[in-house]
């Protein structure tokens, strides 16, 4: 399995972001396909579970991403993307996309470095 991501993503605080992850595999996509998204915070704290897909999508039942993430992928199109809602500044960090599609061997985990930035205010535009 090979993974492709946007590598770097910038999004405005309070908005939603699509974390894009696509993949290729020599094996046909079927019920064995699994997708796991995790998050590594900027402060070096423990990695956190974000999302899981296996036949159906499953949100986390606890933690910071509870009720803030949804599936936006399409396995038949080799798309394992998710939507992250209501971005906060502490969502800054690295999101990892891991796709397993047996019998294909696991590939390198895809990474997206998300930067959540301030909303650009009119005064800032004026001074720019």
């Amino acid at each position: 399995v090979e993974i492709y991501t946007s590598r770097v993503l910038e999004a405005v605080n309070g908005t939603d972001a699509r974390l894009k992850c696509t993949f290729s595999s020599f094996a046909p996509v079927g019920d064995a396909l699994t997708v796991t998204w995790n998050f590594r915070p900027l402060d070096g704290g423990p990695e956190q579970f974000v999302f899981y897909y296996h036949i159906d999508p499953f949100q986390p039942m606890s933690g910071r991403f509870k009720d803030r993430v949804s599936w936006d992928g399409n396995p038949e199109r080799y798309d394992a993307s998710i939507l992250l809602w209501k971005l906060q500044f502490d969502d800054n960090g690295t999101y990892t996309c891991q796709v397993k599609n047996p019998p294909d061997v696991d590939g390198v985990i895809g990474e997206i470095r998300l930067s959540v930035v301030h909303t650009v205010r009119f005064s800032e535009i004026h001074f720019l």
């Epitope: 699994t34 796991t36 995790n38 915070p41 402060d43 704290g45 423990p46 990695e47 956190q48 579970f49 899981y52 296996h54 159906d56 499953f58 986390p60 039942m61 606890s62 933690g63 910071r64 502490d90 397993k100």
Partner: antibody, heavy 116, light 106 residues
């Protein structure tokens, strides 16, 4: 490194209350929800509830609803679990644990003995 | 609440053996966690969301399954693997644990 240090063992009489503390260090306290799990002697694991340290929001196992209160003190990075109306079947080791990719980090456990 | 039933409850095996523990749910769950616990110690995570190894866990441990049936496999038992193993679901609240499987030295 992540550490969760719990308060010491307690012996209580039936009907009393107990408050167990869990001091967290080695990570940003508000970034991870704190859970409480108990284990009766020689028995399996039972989830009590969870608390979001950022806003104090809680979710309890219905079995304990009305008897358990989870709180946090952000200034000291400490979580608390208070269980009231204790009965003998509440005798157990009580653990605090944080949810990361699983319940990855656990306190050392606090033995609460309920005996008349 | 979703009930998890582990089988077997007790298992005797030897170093080097391949061991499989099964966890059956009373209704379909989306994914499963597995923990190892040694006497007097807190549980230690092995597998998260069905098949992902927790940090620092050796590759001899693996997880699989879907729906109502999940398995934990240890490909070649090591002396330090003798312990009690618990499955846990978190597809619906409250999260629940299996009753445990005690793995003993034959």
């Amino acid at each position: 490194q992540v550490q969760l240090v719990q308060s010491g063992a307690e012996v209580k009489k039936p009907g009393a209350s107990v408050k167990v503390s869990c001091k967290a260090s080695g990570y940003t306290f508000t970034n991870y929800w704190m859970h409480w799990v108990r284990q009766a002697p020689g028995q399996g694991l039972e989830w009590i509830g969870e608390i979001n340290p950022t806003n104090g929001g809680t979710d309890y196992n219905e079995k304990f609803q009305g008897r358990v209160t989870l709180t946090v003190d952000k200034s000291s990075s400490t979580a608390y679990m208070e269980l009231s109306s204790l009965r003998s079947e509440d005798t157990a080791v009580y653990y605090c644990t944080i949810y990361t990719t699983a319940l990855d980090y656990w306190g050392q456990g606090t033995l609460v003995t309920v005996s008349s | 609440d979703i009930q998890l039933t582990q089988s077997p409850s007790f298992l005797s095996a030897s170093v080097g053996d391949r061991v499989t523990i099964t966890c059956r749910a009373s209704s379909s769950v989306g994914y499963m966690y597995w923990y190892q616990q040694k006497p007097g110690k807190a549980p230690k995570p092995l597998i998260y969301v069905t098949s992902n190894l927790a940090s620092g866990v050796p590759s001899r441990f693996s997880g699989s399954g879907s729906g109502t049936e999940y398995t934990l496999t240890i490909s070649s038992l090591q002396p330090e693997d003798f312990a009690t193993y618990y499955c846990q679901q978190w597809s619906s609240n409250p999260p629940t644990f299996g009753q445990g499987t005690k793995l003993e030295i034959k």
